[in-house]
Interface confidence: low
């Protein structure tokens, strides 16, 4: 029986050209994390194997750097990363947890003047 | 549904030149990087040349065989990836295959390069 | 340039049984390592990216193993299906280099 949870960072919102981290945390399981990928939509940013360490796809190459942790930087955003991002751990015995963030990129001004949405 | 077409193969005589075409559909274009890769009949592949995306500039990299004398390049407002061959060689036939990031290739053309 | 060797050109295996395939990168490649099959006359397929994860529809008789320089395709419970060349190829840095390829057979 699946028993984990994952928490994320939510809707996050972050300024056009700057980094924001994707973090996400599995808890409520005593389940080995073997792998934990990174998605976009339909597109793979990132995997973080236990065993062979951190992989970044060529699209993502310069712009996605690994890590906090099991986290993800994003860094030089455009307006077009604004969407969708899913950590998809996938973990022995239970299975896959996958989590949800919703990231907005702002015009700085924009930001400069709060964020629309709050991290919980 | 990713498509990738690739279109203007064909005979040329050595020394010349030839523009191959690659029309993509299915994925924003803008977002991936695109490749040229080849294979001589019976031989293995070869990679040839990158393109980046426009987070990256649209840069671009080149095997060391085709260096000057190859050039990539993309149409963004039509989502068509070029490859410009020129002084072309008996050794640059093969099957040129365009690819995309992410494991999406085109069924190829063919060219020949004879005189 | 990062050199691919595919040690095998060719390999012959029974049908239902496993077979393994090596790469060895002339240099580190950080397991940015990704597998094809090609049948004759078609487009090569990416079985493998990251030199473990399997791409979606790929049947789990084939995964990917290594790190550093060496890395190994293998396919369990082989099928008529699966007879086709294999090629390894690096993105860790441009020129993107492909192995030379092995051909699977059945015995």
């Known amino acids: 029986m699946m028993t984990g949870t994952i928490e994320t960072t939510g809707n996050i919102s972050a300024e056009k050209g700057g980094s924001i981290i994707l973090q996400c945390h599995l808890s409520s399981t005593t389940a080995q994390v073997t792998q934990v990928n990174w998605e976009q939509q339909d597109q793979l940013l990132a995997i973080c194997n236990a065993d062979l360490g951190w992989h970044i796809s060529p699209s993502f190459k310069d712009r996605v750097a690994p890590g906090p942790g099991l986290g993800l930087t994003l860094q030089s955003l455009t307006v077009n990363d604004t969407g969708e991002y899913f950590c998809i751990y996938h973990t022995y015995p239970d299975g896959t947890y996958t989590g949800r963030i919703f990231l907005e990129v702002l015009e700085s001004s924009v930001a400069e003047h709060g964020a629309r949405f709050q991290i919980p | 549904e990713v498509k990738l077409v690739e279109s203007g193969g064909g005979l040329v005589q050595p020394g010349g030149s030839l523009r191959l075409s690659c029309a993509t559909s299915?994925?924003?274009?803008?977002?991936?990087?695109m490749s040229w890769v080849r294979q001589p009949p019976g031989k293995a592949l070869e990679w040839l040349a990158l393109?980046?995306?426009?987070?990256?500039?649209?840069?671009?990299e080149y095997s060391a065989s085709v260096k000057g004398r190859f050039t990539i390049s993309r149409d963004n407002s039509q989502s068509i990836l070029y490859l410009q061959m020129n002084t072309l060689r008996a050794e640059d036939s093969a099957t040129y295959y365009c690819?995309?990031?992410?494991?999406?290739w085109g069924q190829g053309t063919t060219l020949t390069v004879s005189s | 340039d990062i050199q691919m060797t595919q040690s095998s050109s060719y390999l012959s295996v029974s049908l239902g049984g496993r077979v393994t395939i090596t790469c060895k990168a002339s240099?580190?490649?950080?397991?940015?390592l990704a597998w094809y099959q090609q049948k004759p006359g078609n487009a090569p397929r990416l079985l493998i990216s990251?030199?473990?994860s399997l791409e979606t529809g790929v049947p789990s008789r084939f995964s990917g193993s290594g790190s550093g320089k060496d890395y190994i395709l293998s396919i369990t419970r082989l099928q008529t299906e699966d007879v086709a060349t294999y090629y390894c190829?690096?993105?860790?840095?441009?020129?993107?280099?492909f192995g030379s390829g092995t051909k699977l057979e059945i015995k």
């Open positions: 240099d580190h490649i950080n397991n940015w």
């Open positions: 299915g994925f924003t274009f803008t977002d991936y990087y």
């Open positions: 990251g030199a473990t």
């Open positions: 690819a995309r990031d992410g494991g999406y």
């Open positions: 393109i980046r995306n426009k987070a990256n500039g649209y840069t671009t």
């Open positions: 190829q690096q993105y860790w840095s441009t020129p993107f280099t």
